[in-house]
Interface confidence: medium
């Protein structure tokens, strides 16, 4: 039962991570105009995303425009776009794999196979989390590098936008959720054939260990 709870928690976390990742990729707030203290550094507030950029004039008027063409964009932006889309698709694939192996579905009857599918989905979610992390960290690195580069004019200095924080959250949730799904597999296969248990023998003592085996100084 605890295993089923872990699975549900894991998949909920990954779903939250996927939604966060989708919002992060879509919002034009990867790079935002730098502020120093309370004063804005540039006359035009600029938001730059993977798909579009927006500018807010000092009058308060805001305009957004989707990037004109793919090939004219910088290569790092193209790579970030690609990784974002791949990460989201990989996570969706992980969800399909999980649904096939979930305790509450009948796509696969064997507990052994179910456990394998849940483990696979966990690994896929972890991969998705890493893929999400790459463009976010790369962009953050570029922003910080430029911010402290004296050759970059102040108008072109940027700060970390909300999309990057959402991206980090998405990556963390995908990694955590995927990790939980991986952890549920040993117990998921505990009633299965003995060769399956042997594969996860390192986990067995932690599951069967009784209170008496813990140091007594931890107990009142």
């Amino acid at each position: 039962m605890a295993s089923a709870g872990m699975q549900i928690l894991g998949v909920v976390l990954t779903l939250l991570g996927w939604v966060n990742g989708l919002v992060s990729c879509a919002l034009p707030m990867w790079k935002v105009t730098a502020f120093i203290g309370n004063s804005i550094v540039v006359a035009q507030v600029v938001w730059e995303g993977l798909w579009m950029s927006c500018v807010v004039q000092s009058t308060g008027q805001m305009q957004c425009k989707v990037y004109d063409s793919l090939l004219a964009l910088p290569q790092d932006l193209q790579a970030a776009r690609a990784l974002c889309v791949i990460a989201l698709l990989v996570a969706l694939f992980g969800l399909l794999v999980y649904l096939a192996g979930a305790k509450c579905t009948t796509c696969v009857e064997e507990k052994d196979s179910k456990a394998r599918l849940v483990l696979t989905s966990g690994i896929v979610f972890v991969i998705s989390g890493v893929l999400t992390l790459i463009p976010v960290c790369w962009t953050a690195h570029a922003i910080i590098r430029d911010f402290y580069n004296p050759l970059v004019a102040e108008a072109q200095k940027r700060e970390l936008g909300a999309s990057l924080y959402l991206g980090w959250a998405a990556s963390g949730l995908l990694l955590l959720g995927g990790g939980l799904l991986c952890c549920t597999c040993p117990s998921g296969g505990s009633q299965g054939p003995s060769h399956y248990m042997a594969r996860y023998s390192t986990s067995a003592p932690a599951i069967s260990r009784g209170p008496s085996e813990y140091p007594t100084k931890n107990y009142v």
């Epitope: 006359a43 035009q44 600029v46 579009m52 950029s53 927006c54 004109d68 910088p74 970059v152 102040e154």
Partner: antibody
């Protein structure tokens, strides 16, 4: 219509200072950076510096940093460029130019330019 | 500082010719490059921004390409009014102009 109108030609002696003005109209002055670019006779263009009219903060080309001062007066929508310790090689046409951000390309450009002010340094 | 090497420094061409000017940055400037046209006694005029985007009102015979360190500016069919000096300008790190290319009548 966006317009940048600069002050008239100046003749200065070596060691003196010159202050060139650039009056902006047709747009919100505080909404766009103002840049200064110079061009010596028969030579190429050389960026000198820029000012954020909203805050007054400036960025200068290292080559001119010790001698150039860019200021602005928001009440009259005018930017100023003062160059001190003039020498003969400072004889040039000085331009002010507005910086704009181009949506859809993550790019800036100097889109509108003043007519230029000829500064002649001669003893 | 970033150096912008523009070539050739001058060229002679006839009306209808295809003209190509190159600009090389000493380090990557991404797509942060503009092209300007300047006629004698006049202020420069923006033709291309973002390395390849045509400014509004600029004829389609003008085009730009490139990213990183190598950029190309092309006039597909030279017209009489195109005889002028052309400059590249990077704005990735401050602003740096190329030395200029004077396009003269052959």
């Amino acid at each position: 219509e966006v317009q940048l109108v600069q002050s008239g030609a100046e003749v200065k002696k070596p060691g003196a200072s010159v202050k060139v003005s650039c009056k902006a109209s047709g747009y919100t002055f505080t909404g766009y950076y103002m840049n200064w670019v110079r061009q010596a006779p028969g030579q190429g263009l050389e960026w000198m510096g820029e000012i954020n009219p909203a805050t007054g903060s400036t960025t200068y080309n290292q080559k001119f940093k010790a001698r150039v001062t860019i200021t602005r007066d928001t009440s009259t929508s005018t930017a100023y460029m003062e160059l001190s310790s003039l020498r003969s090689e400072d004889t040039a046409v000085y331009y002010c130019a507005r910086r704009d951000y181009y949506l859809g390309s993550n790019s800036y450009a100097l889109d509108y330019w003043g007519q230029g002010t000829l500064v002649t340094v001669s003893s | 500082d970033i150096q912008m090497t523009q070539s050739p420094s001058s060229l002679s061409a006839s009306v209808g010719d295809r003209v190509t000017i190159t600009c090389q940055a000493s380090q990557s400037v991404s797509n942060n490059l503009n092209w300007y046209q300047q006629k004698p006694g006049k202020a420069p005029k923006l033709l291309i921004y973002g390395a390849s985007k045509l400014e509004d009102g600029v004829p389609s015979r003008f085009s730009g390409s490139g990213s990183g360190t190598d950029f190309t500016f092309t006039i597909s069919s030279l017209q009489p009014e195109d005889f002028a000096t052309y400059y590249c300008l990077q704005h990735r790190y401050m602003w740096t102009f190329g030395q200029g290319t004077k396009v003269e009548i052959k």
